[in-house]
């Protein structure tokens, strides 16, 4: 029900990557505005994005307080220019979001190969430890800081002259692999959280190849 000129939000969807978290919904407002509330299962509701005509709301600041909590959001609809107006039940129309647990559900952002260094027939490939918006003691935590032992990286590597890929895995942000002397190799990495049931893998990093600027070659 509600007032004749407001419609409830629908298709409430969490969009989250490396804990940057935005709630999106429909429809685009016509003569109405929205306010979002967010809470943990046991907590109080906190209002965000007051009387907005947007159909998204950045809730990052709230969820990074504890990324292991489960959050619920709701979107209220109000008539434009008359936000005091309520529905027939005495309150504005609203719709609930699905529950969202950032630690278990945020997408893993595309990783970046920070560097690679060849020493003889070994190559050390280092993955950039991306900073998140999660804070502890006033410092931003890296992806590794947050996910710890739950986060692994998979390295895909192949000779520039062929298409046959090999893989390696690491529980740190570094790989040490064996390569053939005199061959150039290309590399791509992927972040993985094996214990997850959803959003287990990131997209692959951009490909980096030996003989280009990122790496360093030392003949020993």
């Amino acid at each position: 029900s509600g007032t004749t000129n407001t419609v409830a939000a629908y298709n409430l969807t969490w969009k989250s990557t490396n804990f940057k978290t935005i709630l999106e919904w429909e429809p685009k407002p016509v003569n109405q505005v929205y306010t979002v509330q967010i809470s943990t299962k046991s907590g109080d509701w906190k209002s965000k994005c007051f009387y907005t005509t947007d159909t998204e709301c950045d809730l990052t600041d709230e969820i990074v307080k504890d990324v292991k909590q489960t959050y619920l959001a709701r979107v209220f609809s109000y008539p434009a220019g008359n936000v005091e107006s309520t529905g027939s039940a005495g309150e504005p129309l609203y719709e609930n979001s699905p529950e969202f647990t950032p630690y278990l559900e945020t997408n893993l952002g595309q990783p970046t190969i920070q560097s690679f260094e060849q020493v003889g027939t070994k190559v050390n490939v280092t993955v950039e430890d991306e900073r998140t918006l999660v804070r502890r003691n006033n410092t931003f935590l890296s992806l590794r800081d947050v996910f710890g032992k739950d986060l692994i990286y998979t390295l895909y590597y192949w000779k520039s002259s062929s298409s046959g890929k090999k893989t390696a895995k690491t529980n740190t942000n570094e790989f040490l692999i064996d390569v053939d002397k005199g061959e150039n190799y290309c590399f791509s990495v992927q972040a993985v959280i094996p214990s997850r049931t959803v959003n287990r893998k990131s997209t692959d990093s951009p490909v980096e190849c030996m003989g280009q600027e990122k790496g360093e070659f030392r003949e020993i």
Epitope: K41, K68, T101, Y103, L104, G148, T197
Partner: antibody, heavy 121, light 109 residues
Framework: QVQLQESGAEVKKPGASVKVSCKAS????????IEWVRQAPGQGLEWMGE????????KYNEKFKGRVTMTADTSTNTVYMELSSLRSEDTAVYYC??????????????WGQGTLVTVSS | QAVVTQEPSLTVSPGGTVTLTCRSS?????????ANWVQQKPGQLPKGLIS???NRGPWTTARFSGSILGDKAVLTLWGAHTEDEAVYYC?????????FGGGTKLTVL
Amino acid sequence: QVQLQESGAEVKKPGASVKVSCKASGYTFSSYWIEWVRQAPGQGLEWMGEILPGSASTKYNEKFKGRVTMTADTSTNTVYMELSSLRSEDTAVYYCARDYYYGSSYGFAYWGQGTLVTVSS
Amino acid sequence: QAVVTQEPSLTVSPGGTVTLTCRSSTGAVTTSNYANWVQQKPGQLPKGLISGTNNRGPWTTARFSGSILGDKAVLTLWGAHTEDEAVYYCALWYSNHWVFGGGTKLTVL
């Protein structure tokens, strides 16, 4: 506050199975690994395995693979550890534990009160 | 499986400083081993002191400090009290499993 409440003492015969429960409260159950650790009389601590309730992902100590099963019931915030084909050497106090924070603080911060399992014919 | 080695026993005087070490049979201990230190007093439950190498639990007194020194994980206790007498266990993470050391019996005498 975080609490882990374990089930009561059990006496089992060799060859039987035992299922120990650990009911969690005071935190978001699905997001934290629960560890199972045992301690035989007068001995040190021995890690048995772990489970992440939100995904039911498990990791087991090779020593117990095939004999141990860990499960989680998210409707009751309870984790279970079942150990089969019991022998006298399995007589021990069985603890569940949880880490303190996320990320680099994985491990064994909060502990249950322990469940004594006695295997005797 | 890896073996984690600790000193079987150590003695410290009240008010003194003592260092407990934790070695890995596979090589140097790193932050990726997420070293834990667990205290167990006689007849009591284990209690987590340090996790992730150097993170104190909210109940852990500042007299305890965790670190990596060279190739070992280290628990340092400053200003030892008689109530610190306990067995201290180290646990290290190896890719997909934890391994506990045999424990160090600390006597404050």
